[in-house]
Amino acid sequence: LIIGFGISGKHFITVTTFTSAGNIGEDGTLSCTFEPDIKLNGIVIQWLKEGIKGLVHEFKEGKDDLSQQHEMFRGRTAVFADQVVVGNASLRLKNVQLTDAGTYTCYIRTSKGKGNANLEYKTGAFSMPEINVDYNASSESLRCEAPRWFPQPTVAWASQVDQGANFSEVSNTSFELNSENVTMKVVSVLYNVTINNTYSCMIENDIAKATGDIKVTDSEVKRRSQLQLLNSG
């Protein structure tokens, strides 16, 4: 969370950004809020990126102005125009690429004053893991798969019954490059699992942490997955 202040004569407004992460090949959002101003035509929003000449995006007088937009962002950005009057200057980014990572500045000018705040945008790939019982194995085993990760993550197993146990000796993890030659599919197999236990497969890189849980009993298999972006707030 970054809060910036700006001074315009005697006036300053608070601009707030949130460190966020983009999943390559998908839509991303660069979050920025400011003190609302009901006079839409008096609001100017400028998004800038460190190291890039020209603007990422500009919105003024109630509409987009792309006359100074850098070519790498052409056709890839939009503000949430209907939410600008309530103080939302967040930017929607199409087809996030690794090269979109960096420091962005959200600059705001309204009839109340002006202000800006920086935002650190990380890019990579992250996805939910799915755990299944591998009945093909000679002994009962679990297979944890997640289709897209970058940079290469670490994978660890845990169990409710054997808390603190190290499963690295009884698991095997592989990383398979996907067709676009950037992201990788993560596959981890845990051997010699026991019934009536809950196992967790944890995948983590510097952008995200994902956990898949599976509870295997005689009568049913229960699964749960969650994904958490790191350093977002």
Epitope: I24, G25, D64, R74, S179
Partner: antibody, heavy 121, light 107 residues
Framework: EVQLVQSGAEVKKPGASVKVSCKAS????????IGWVRQAPGQGLEWIGD????????NYNEKFKGRVTITRDTSTSTAYLELSSLRSEDTAVYYC??????????????WGQGTLVTVSS | DIQMTQSPSSLSASVGDRVTITCKAS??????VAWYQQKPGKAPKLLIY???TLQPGVPSRFSGSGSGRDYTLTISSLQPEDFATYYC?????????FGQGTKVEIK
């Protein structure tokens, strides 16, 4: 309500040029990309290119580069497709379409009625 | 440039059938795949965008899925008004590209 109204059918001779218009209403013309797509008789859809009326920025299918020009007139909220050096295989229905997402180039969500261009000697 | 290979080119089905149409992208990964329905003499109609988001007003029997290079349009229970030609569109790249189309006919 978003509406795209295209100009009428055209018959042209090989080697000539054609200019098709697409008049937009029901939204802020300068805020949304407009694309052009064609469909030859009994064939599939083929993307030609698009324009951002707010700045005049264009993207073109490599297949048509050098022969196609997409322009706009913001005073009349009209986009134009001009295709030169016409040949018989350019005979098709030409559609204009608005791209969703305003300055973000999205999928084509509203379409014109189509303009039949016939190239015949 | 990303090309989209659509299959099958045509299929015959009955009312109530489940129908699946696929598109394969020539490269890369992005979720920017849309699906259109077109009837003879009419402009295409947007059904689904961003792989799986249903366009407002489109019946819920239409659904989209996919990841990586493979994308699918499913009609869960074919209705009489669904007999038409369907196209996928890749719109994540700078240059857009349609699939060749799939004609859904009455068996």
């Amino acid at each position: 309500e978003v509406q795209l109204v295209q100009s009428g059918a055209e018959v042209k001779k090989p080697g000539a040029s054609v200019k098709v218009s697409c008049k937009a209403s029901g939204y802020t013309f300068t805020s949304y990309w407009i694309g052009w797509v064609r469909q030859a008789p009994g064939q599939g859809l083929e993307w030609i290119g698009d324009i951002y009326p707010g700045g005049g920025y264009t993207n073109y299918n490599e297949k048509f580069k050098g022969r196609v020009t997409i322009t706009r007139d913001t005073s009349t909220s009209t986009a134009y497709l001009e295709l030169s050096s016409l040949r018989s295989e350019d005979t098709a229905v030409y559609y204009c379409a608005r791209l969703a997402g305003s300055s973000y180039r999205g999928a084509m969500d509203s379409w014109g009625q189509g303009t039949l261009v016939t190239v015949s000697s | 440039d990303i090309q989209m290979t659509q299959s099958p080119s045509s299929l015959s089905a009955s009312v109530g059938d489940r129908v699946t149409i696929t598109c394969k992208a020539s490269q890369g990964f992005n979720k920017y795949v849309a699906w259109y329905q077109q009837k003879p003499g009419k402009a295409p109609k947007l059904l689904i965008y961003y792989t799986s988001t249903l366009q407002p007003g489109v019946p819920s029997r239409f659904s989209g899925s996919g990841s990586g290079r493979d994308y699918t349009l499913t009609i869960s229970s074919l209705q009489p008004e669904d007999f038409a030609t369907y196209y996928c569109l890749q719109y994540g790249d700078l240059l857009y590209a349609f699939g060749q189309g799939t004609k859904v006919e009455i068996k």
